[in-house]
């Protein structure tokens, strides 16, 4: 039975040209995290494998940095980066947990962070 929950940074906004940290946290389970995949609309951004470390997709090498922790830092943001991002936690023995973050990249200098929310 999957008892864990994923807490994410929720709906967030950032300025064009700036950076943003995507963060997820798995709680309420003792399952072992074997791998975390980061996706943007079905496209792989990065993998953090517990044994083998990080892989940043070649398509994003120049704009994506690993961390902090199991999170991901997006740099040199453009309006095209607006959209859904997913953290996919592969765990043993529970299985797969998925968290969703919506990022809006704003042209203006006013960019406020949204509230946190949980996905069971």
């Amino acid at each position: 039975m999957m008892t864990g929950t994923i807490e994410t940074t929720g709906n967030i906004s950032a300025e064009k040209g700036g950076s943003i940290i995507l963060q997820c946290h798995l709680s309420s389970t003792t399952a072992q995290v074997t791998q975390v995949n980061w996706e943007q609309q079905d496209q792989l951004l990065a993998i953090c494998n517990a044994d083998l470390g990080w892989h940043i997709s070649p398509s994003f090498k120049d704009r994506v940095a690993p961390g902090p922790g199991l999170g991901l830092t997006l740099q040199s943001l453009t309006v095209n980066d607006t959209g859904e991002y997913f953290c996919i936690y592969h765990t043993y023995p529970d299985g797969t947990y998925t968290g969703r973050i919506f990022l809006e990249v704003l042209e203006s200098s006013v960019a406020e962070h949204g509230a946190r929310f949980q996905i069971p």
């Epitope: 995949n37 996706e39 494998n49 470390g53 892989h55």
Partner: antibody, heavy 122, light 113 residues
Framework: EVQLVQSGAEVKKPGSSVKVSCKAS????????IGWVRQAPGQGLEWIGD????????NYNEKFKDRVTITADKSTSTAYMEFSSLRSEDTAVYYC???????????????WGQGTLVTVSS | DIVMTQSPDSLAVSLGERATINCKSS????????????LAWYQQKPGQSPKLLIY???TRESGVPDRFSGSGSGTDFTLTISSLQAEDVAVYYC?????????FGGGTKVEIK
């Protein structure tokens, strides 16, 4: 011992399709990329595409994108490459490879299958 | 696409002598975050599958003799066989794995003079 064992040689008619398999053993299948590379007779190496089974993420060479589908079956640790609308110039040896593209090890295509000769002829 | 240009196309070297193969990429293969160049070298003997020799420009794969060495950074790379042996007769390919699509050089055929 890491091994990649490919299916046998194929002879195909122009316009048809071929599906080549690659069975992996000796490592955790879902942790590494499986790539496909071809080599026409007497020619060099050409990357077709790859798949990461731990998420089924695929990447294709634009040159082949409309004609190639790469899949993986984690239950049998087997990857497949299906090539459609075959032409005589697709006659080649097709290799599967294991790819290590982690930023801390980065060993590229560290293991290769024995190759599968696909002959396209009318 | 990154274009990989190898030279020479073929090379005849006496046993025990040095063989040098060059590889040039059309853009830098250096990844700033780990300061590694995503460049590999493969050896393909007649009738065999290619075999990984060197990755990250200069790291020898396990079991590869130390007469094989790689060097370079950015866009210019070299594979050196310090003392050619009969079993080194093969075609050698460089390959970039920095960006998609991964691309290979055209190959260099090494023969005994």
């Amino acid at each position: 011992e890491v091994q990649l064992v490919q299916s046998g040689a194929e002879v195909k008619k122009p316009g048809s399709s071929v599906k080549v398999s690659c069975k992996a053993s000796g490592y955790t299948f879902s942790n590494y990329w499986i790539g496909w590379v071809r080599q026409a007779p007497g020619q060099g190496l050409e990357w077709i595409g790859d798949i990461y089974p731990g998420g089924a993420y695929t990447n294709y060479n634009e040159k082949f994108k409309d004609r190639v589908t790469i899949t993986a079956d984690k239950s049998t640790s087997t990857a497949y490459m299906e090539f459609s609308s075959l032409r005589s110039e697709d006659t080649a040896v097709y290799y599967c490879t294991r790819g290590d593209y982690y930023d801390s090890s980065g060993r590229a295509m560290d293991y290769w299958g024995q190759g599968t000769l696909v002959t396209v002829s009318s | 696409d990154i274009v990989m240009t190898q030279s020479p196309d073929s090379l005849a070297v006496s046993l025990g002598e040095r063989a040098t193969i060059n590889c040039k990429s059309s853009q830098s293969l250096l990844y700033s975050r780990n300061q590694m160049n995503y460049l590999a070298w493969y050896q393909q003997k007649p009738g065999q599958s290619p075999k990984l020799l060197i990755y990250w420009t200069s790291t020898r794969e396990s079991g590869v003799p130390d007469r094989f060495s790689g060097s370079g950074s950015g866009t210019d790379f070299t594979l050196t066989i310090s003392s050619l042996q009969a079993e080194d007769v093969a075609v050698y390919y460089c390959q970039q794995y920095y960006s998609y699509p991964y691309t290979f050089g055209g190959g260099t055929k090494v023969e005994i003079k």
